[in-house]
Each structure stands twice: as C-alpha cells, then as structure tokens.
C-alpha cells in the first residue's frame, strides 16, 4: 500500500477526511480508524524539537508542510 503524491501546501487549514467525525484517516494504511476517545494531546516532552511541521490535506495529496504547526501526540491507534 502506498500513499499518493505529497505536496507542500504551507499552513492550509486541514481538509475534510473521508472518515466520519468519530474516525481519523490513518495515512500509513490509508483508511479510517476509530479515534474519538484518543484525541487528547499529551504535553510535548521537554527538550524535544517540534514535530515535523505538516498540515492535513486531502488524502490524495496526503500531508504537506506547515511551518511552526504543532502536532498532537496520539496513542498508536493502528
């Protein structure tokens, strides 16, 4: 399984996913998984650099770069 081409779209607002509101789109395997109970971010560990800056886009475009945007650490839903 492979994701589609990735574009760098800066800090665009996240586009809607093909998933229902209680689900998230897992980019590794390209399908929706339940995530409603697992959305709470953990505090960013001290000393860690900021996560790779990216913005959620349409699945076909996958994920681009958005400088300075913080990612939310999430339990490993897959």
């Amino acid at each position: 399984m492979r994701r589609g081409p990735r574009s760098l779209r800066g800090r665009d607002a996240p586009a809607p996913t093909p998933c229902v509101p209680a689900e998230c789109f897992d980019l590794l395997v390209r399908h929706c998984v339940a995530c409603g109970l697992l959305r709470t971010p953990r505090p960013k560990p001290a000393g860690a650099s900021s996560p790779a800056p990216r913005t959620a886009l349409q699945p076909q475009e996958s994920v681009g770069a958005g400088a300075g945007e913080a990612a939310l650490p999430l339990p490993g839903l897959l």
Partner: antibody, heavy 126, light 107 residues
Framework: EVQLVQSGGGVVQPGRSLRLSCAAS????????MHWVRQAPGKCLEWVAV????????YYGDSVKGRFTISRDNSKNTLYLQMNSLRDEDTAVYYC???????????????????WGQGTTVTVSS | EIVLTQSPSSLSASVGDRVTITCRAS??????LNWYQQKPGKAPKLLIY???SLQSGVPSRFSGSGSGTDFTLTISSLQPEDFATYYC?????????FGCGTKVEIK
Amino acid sequence: EVQLVQSGGGVVQPGRSLRLSCAASGFTFGSYGMHWVRQAPGKCLEWVAVIWYDGSNKYYGDSVKGRFTISRDNSKNTLYLQMNSLRDEDTAVYYCARRFTHLRGQYIEDYGMDVWGQGTTVTVSS
Amino acid sequence: EIVLTQSPSSLSASVGDRVTITCRASQSISSYLNWYQQKPGKAPKLLIYAASSLQSGVPSRFSGSGSGTDFTLTISSLQPEDFATYYCQQSYSIPLTFGCGTKVEIK
C-alpha cells in the same frame, strides 16, 4: 516506567511452531498499535507485523505472511506472535515495539516505534 | 516495497568528530523517515522521527534533515556512548522497511 518485557523464544526444529509474548506495563496498552520486528544474526532489521490497538486489523511482511499471526489480549496487556511452519531463515532476535503516531487534524501520521522490548532469540535448527 | 540504502555501511571516527550518515529511499517518502541507534545485544532506540524531530530524552547533538528521497543523520560532536549502529526506517507505507545500518566505530 514504560516497558515491554518479552518471553517465549528458544530453539525449535524446522516446520514446528513457537509463540512469543510481549508484556506491556507503564502505559495504556489498549490504546496503542504494536509491531514485531526481527533481526537475523549480523543482518538488517526486518519488520514482521503490526496490529491495531483493538486487534481489528493486522498487516504482515511478505516473508511471514500465511505462517505468522500477530494477536493481542488487552485485558492482559500482552502482545503475541504465533509462528508456524518455521524455517531456518526465521532464526533471529525478535522485538516487540510500540507504534508512535501524531494526530494532525483528522489525519494520523506514523513516526516509527518509540518503545521496544528487550528482544527474544528464536533459533530454528534441526 | 520502499528500499532504504544507507551509506556508509561503516565508518571510523574519534570522540569530538562531526559524523554524517545518509539514507536514500527508492521513492519519495516525504518526511516519514526515522532514525534509530542500536548497541550490541540491545534493542534499537528511536532518536529522530519525521526526518528532523528529536525524540524526547535524546541529546541535542543528534539532528536529522532531508525530505523526499535523501536524508541525513548528523552527530555534531561524537561522544563515547555514540559508538553504535544507526538505522533509518520509513513509515510512509506498508511494508515498513529499514536501512541495513551504519556502524560507527572508534578510530
């Protein structure tokens, strides 16, 4: 302390079966996807399998597909790897590892494996 | 399957040296590239995720860069505890794959 403690390795004859276990502690096991990764003596790391946090979906590397089964018991905080029809080339140190992800909007991005077990050795030999 | 090619396969360096390891992917993987350190008889340890993000607790002398197909792990000033084997790994698609490692040895 977050940790994964493995057991179940050993010496087994070709064609036989073995089950590996990985006991998790220090985190909410049922909220995390889990992997098995192996390393043959003097060789590269090889991804073996992954299982969803709830056990609903599983993926396997081509070399083990149809022979190995990944499973979990969230009530026991334990991950398993059932290895059937073992071959000489399955000889390796096997590691369990926790999936590391970030959420961006409604998208889950995969960032590798952030917690690893100590490894358990499986030797397939007649 | 995405193939990751690491270079060099081994290198000799001294304490205090700046060390650079490269990883090339057979197709674009955006920034979905992670780096691990492994010492003999031990499990791998995550150092860098998403090409350039430092994992919690990892010393700041480790850094990563790159995107697309070409990635670099840099150790700015090699310390005695850094002598180990380093692996890259892609988390862009299943099957997940690893490079075959770069062994950093004492000169």
